[in-house]
Structures are given as structure tokens and as C-alpha cells.
């Protein structure tokens, strides 16, 4: 049961977290405008990794795709490659786990087979928040060099090829929704890799041998009885998840809306 | 076709108050700022505040924290409440549109005359 | 407080000559986000509210005759009668959209030499 809960809470958190990683790659505000040493501006930029944006006083907003590849800086394709290597990651990953979950029956899928989609979808979710993370990181980096950066050759933003000594960019919304989706993306894959532990079967089935002591008319004979294992005549090693309650085998199967044959 | 209308104008002594009012027809309150912008007798314009379709504003210095502007989306009617008058506050006091984007004054009222006096 | 300074103060032209109108901001007036400068002018009858020529410092409002031209960007603009005409006698006025408070120049008086 705690395997089955360790799993799907994984999987939650996890599609939470790849939510967030899709939201902050969309998102426009990655970087807006400092105000602190002119918040009377009546224009305020902000900028994606898309596109930037000026809103004005007025409610009118402007945006202007990037539409040149090599005219960017190559931190924002790193940045942006990242941020899409994290969301095709975790959506493979997703679409692994859905068919490792346990509370889902899919024919005669073996635990074996639940246990290692569910470690590749963990490790998957692991190395998708991993890029977003460093995604947002690498662009939280690049804001923080340019912010104390003063010379006016320099880019302002992603977009923008011309600098105005007083625009200066603080760190956006984007930056902090893609932290914490990475996170929870990371937390998610985790969770996956300890339920794959407890999806595992075991390998050996230990079969003790029963020393009777006998009398001298008695002959010893060996495997005479089998001992017990606690799975009865079960030979195939079978965990017992409902308190022990039942074997998986035990409980009667009727079609339902989760089973995908 | 777009009009603005002020009224509200007159003489008063300093230290006293008084409420301008500007009626707007054509557009919608709700989706374009209107601003205040006075003109001194015989001198230039110069801005006063705004109150932006969201209703956010902002004030010239020398009005902030006397002149409070306002508005009333379902009467059309924007409005200046000037507090504690100066007699440089004297000038003809005019409302005029934003246009919406980069921010300019495309439709003014013809103005009304606000004398501080003793 | 952004300071705009017109110049001259006062300009007497010839009928279908040339006019120019300086305009100089304290602070650059240009938007790095969209390459757009906020500054709009203005034109003044007597006894007339102000009307407007010219937003983002070089498109013409409509309506407006094409003798109009504004132009500069950052710091410095102008605004270009091309061809004086009797109706153009006014004050012309620039303003400031980018910070507030909005303010105007002291105007420039344009008359008929």
C-alpha cells in the first residue's frame, strides 16, 4: 500500500511539477524591467524566452517574437534548450509512469516490468527538473551579470540588440514558477525511484530443507518436505500488498476503466 | 464622435476647494485613461494627473496630495477634486483623452477657467 | 522631473518655407523594449485647446497634413513644417509620455516673417 502511495503521489507531484516546466518555458515575464531606481516610468518591459513585451500605463501591451536564431545570444538558446530537453524529459517520463503505475492493470504486465518503467520514468523526472532548474539557473545568472554590467554596448535583454543606459532587467515571475516546478519535477522522479524498491520482486525463492531427528530405523530423506515460505503452494514469488490480507493473484480481476489491454 | 466636456470652474478664494467635472462621450471610461492638463493665463500647458482605464493614477508634484482625480464609469464623468487651492493653481484646467498606445492626448475638452482669488 | 527644453522660443517664417522645431529631453525618451520614443507634439491656436500632431515622435495623427514631420530619437527631436501655411500659425509644444509626471515644453511660438 505505502509502494502504491510512494508511486502515485510521485507521479502527481511529478506532473505537477513538468506543468510548471511547460508554464515557465511559455511564460513572457523570465526577466521585467527594474523599477527601483525609476519606478515612475510609464512603459514597462519584460522579456521571455520567446519573446519581449512592453506594457504600457495605457493597459496596451506589445509584444515582438524573437524571429532571429542567429542574431540571440547563445545563453538563450542554452537556456532555451534546457527548458525543452526538461519538458520532452518529463513527458516521456509521464507517459512511462502512467503505464507503471500500480493501481493500474495492463494485461499480464509482470512487476518486474511495473518496477523498471517506473525507475525510467523516475530517473526521467529526475533529469527533466534537473534541466529546468539549470535552465532557470543559467538565466537567472546571465540577468545578474548583465544587471551590474553599466557599459551601454551591451544586450539588455534576449531580444534586444540596442542598449539604453537606464533599462536594467530583474529577475521575472518565469524564473520562480520554473524553480519550483523543477523542483517538484525532481522530488516527483525521486519518489518514483524509492517506489521502484518496493515494486522489485524478489529474485530468490529460499527453499529450506526440513532435518527431522529420527530414530536408527529411519532413513534421512532430503527435500521430503517444503518448507513454509508464507506463500503456501504459490511458487511464484508474489508480494502481498493489503496487509497480507491476500496475494495479487488472490484477488478476483473484472475489467475496468484502468485496464488497457 | 468622441467629446469631452468640463465643468465645474469659477472663482474661489485660496485654501478653499472646489470639483471640476468632465463629461465623456464616444468611448468608454473603462477602456481609456483621461488626463487633467491646465494652462496658466498666458503661460504653457502643463500636465496635472491621469486616471488610467484600470483606474491606477498619477499627479504632477506640485498637486500631490491636494488634487484627487477621479472617475465614474457608469455616468461617463471623470472629475478633479482640488483641495487647499493656491493662486497659482489659477489657469484654464482642460481633459483630454490617451489614445490608448504610446501614450498621447488625442481628444481634448475645450477647458474650463478656474480663478484662485481673495 | 524629465525637463524639456524647445528652442527657439519664438519663430517667424516666411509662407511656404521651411520651419523647424527643436525639442530636447533631460532623459532619453527612448524605449529599449520596442525601439519606440515617447514624445508627442502639440499644436495651439489662440483660444483653442491643444491639438495633436505628432505621438511616438515621428507618426503623424490623423488628419494631420503631411508638411508635418517629427523626427530624433533618445534625446533630441524636431518637429518640421515643410511648407509654412497662413493656418499653422500657433504655439507648438512637445511633450513627454515616457515618465511621469508628463511634462510639456515651455512652447515654441511660430508666426508668418
Known amino acids: 500500500m505505502a509502494v502504491t502511495a510512494c508511486q502515485g503521489l510521485g507521479f502527481v507531484v511529478s506532473l505537477i511539477g513538468i506543468a510548471g516546466i511547460i508554464a515557465a518555458t511559455c511564460m513572457d515575464q523570465w526577466s521585467t524591467q527594474d523599477l527601483y531606481n525609476n519606478p515612475v516610468t510609464a512603459v514597462f518591459n519584460y522579456q521571455g524566452l520567446w519573446r519581449s513585451c512592453v506594457r504600457e500605463s495605457s493597459g496596451f501591451t506589445e509584444c515582438r517574437g524573437y524571429f532571429t536564431l542567429l542574431g540571440l545570444p547563445a545563453m538563450l538558446q542554452a537556456v532555451r534548450a534546457l527548458m525543452i530537453v526538461g519538458i520532452v524529459l518529463g513527458a516521456i517520463g509521464l507517459l512511462v509512469s502512467i503505464f507503471a503505475l500500480k493501481c493500474i492493470r495492463i494485461g499480464s504486465m509482470e512487476d518486474s516490468a511495473k518496477a523498471n518503467m517506473t525507475l525510467t520514468s523516475g530517473i526521467m523526472f529526475i533529469v527533466s527538473g534537473l534541466c529546468a532548474i539549470a535552465g532557470v539557473s543559467v538565466f537567472a545568472n546571465m540577468l545578474v551579470t548583465n544587471f551590474w554590467m553599466s557599459t551601454a554596448n551591451m544586450y539588455t535583454g534576449m531580444g534586444g540588440m540596442v542598449q539604453t543606459v537606464q533599462t536594467r532587467y530583474t529577475f521575472g515571475a518565469a524564473l520562480f514558477v520554473g524553480w519550483v516546478a523543477g523542483g517538484l519535477t525532481l522530488i516527483g522522479g525521486v519518489m518514483m525511484c524509492i517506489a521502484c524498491r518496493g515494486l522489485a520482486p524478489e529474485e530468490t525463492n529460499y527453499k529450506a530443507v526440513s532435518y527431522h531427528a529420527s530414530g536408527h530405523s529411519v532413513a534421512y530423506k532430503p527435500g521430503g518436505f517444503k518448507a513454509s515460505t508464507g506463500f503456501g503452494s504459490n511458487t511464484k514469488n508474489k508480494k502481498i500488498y493489503d496487509g497480507g490480507a491476500r496475494t495479487e493473484d488472490e484477488v478476483q480481476s473484472y475489467p475496468s476503466k484502468h485496464d488497457y489491454v | 464622435q468622441v467629446q469631452l466636456v468640463e465643468s465645474g470652474g469659477g472663482v474661489v478664494q485660496p485654501g478653499r476647494s472646489l470639483r471640476l467635472s468632465c463629461a465623456a462621450s464616444?468611448?468608454?471610461?473603462?477602456?481609456?485613461?483621461v488626463y487633467w492638463v491646465r494652462q496658466a493665463p498666458g503661460k504653457g500647458l502643463e500636465w496635472v494627473a491621469v486616471?488610467?482605464?484600470?483606474?491606477?493614477?498619477n499627479y504632477a508634484d506640485s498637486v500631490k496630495g491636494r488634487f484627487t482625480i477621479s472617475k465614474d464609469n457608469s455616468k461617463s464623468t471623470l472629475y478633479l477634486q482640488m483641495n487647499s487651492l493656491r493662486a497659482e493653481d489659477t489657469a484654464v484646467y482642460y481633459c483630454?483623452?490617451?489614445?490608448?498606445?504610446?501614450?498621447?492626448?488625442?481628444?481634448w475638452g475645450q477647458g474650463t477657467l478656474v480663478t484662485v482669488s481673495s | 522631473d524629465i525637463v524639456m527644453t524647445q528652442s527657439p522660443d519664438s519663430l517667424a517664417v516666411s509662407l511656404g518655407e521651411r520651419a523647424t522645431i527643436n525639442c530636447k529631453s533631460s532623459?532619453?525618451?527612448?524605449?529599449?523594449?520596442?525601439?519606440?520614443?515617447?514624445l508627442a507634439w502639440y499644436q495651439q491656436k489662440p483660444g483653442q485647446p491643444p491639438k495633436l500632431l505628432i505621438y511616438?515622435?515621428?507618426t503623424r495623427e490623423s488628419g494631420v497634413p503631411d508638411r508635418f514631420t517629427g523626427s530624433g530619437s533618445g534625446t533630441d527631436f524636431t518637429l518640421t513644417i515643410s511648407s509654412l501655411q497662413a493656418e499653422d500659425v500657433a504655439v507648438y509644444y512637445c511633450?513627454?509620455?515616457?515618465?511621469?509626471?508628463?511634462?510639456f515644453g515651455q512652447g515654441t511660438k511660430v508666426e508668418i516673417k
Open positions: 483630454a483623452r490617451d489614445r490608448g498606445r504610446l501614450l498621447a492626448m488625442d481628444y
Open positions: 464616444g468611448f468608454t471610461l473603462t477602456s481609456y485613461g
Open positions: 486616471v488610467w482605464a484600470g483606474g491606477n493614477t
Open positions: 532623459q532619453s525618451l527612448l524605449n529599449s523594449g520596442n525601439q519606440k520614443n515617447y
Open positions: 511616438g515622435a515621428s
Open positions: 511633450q513627454n509620455d515616457h515618465f511621469f509626471p508628463f511634462t
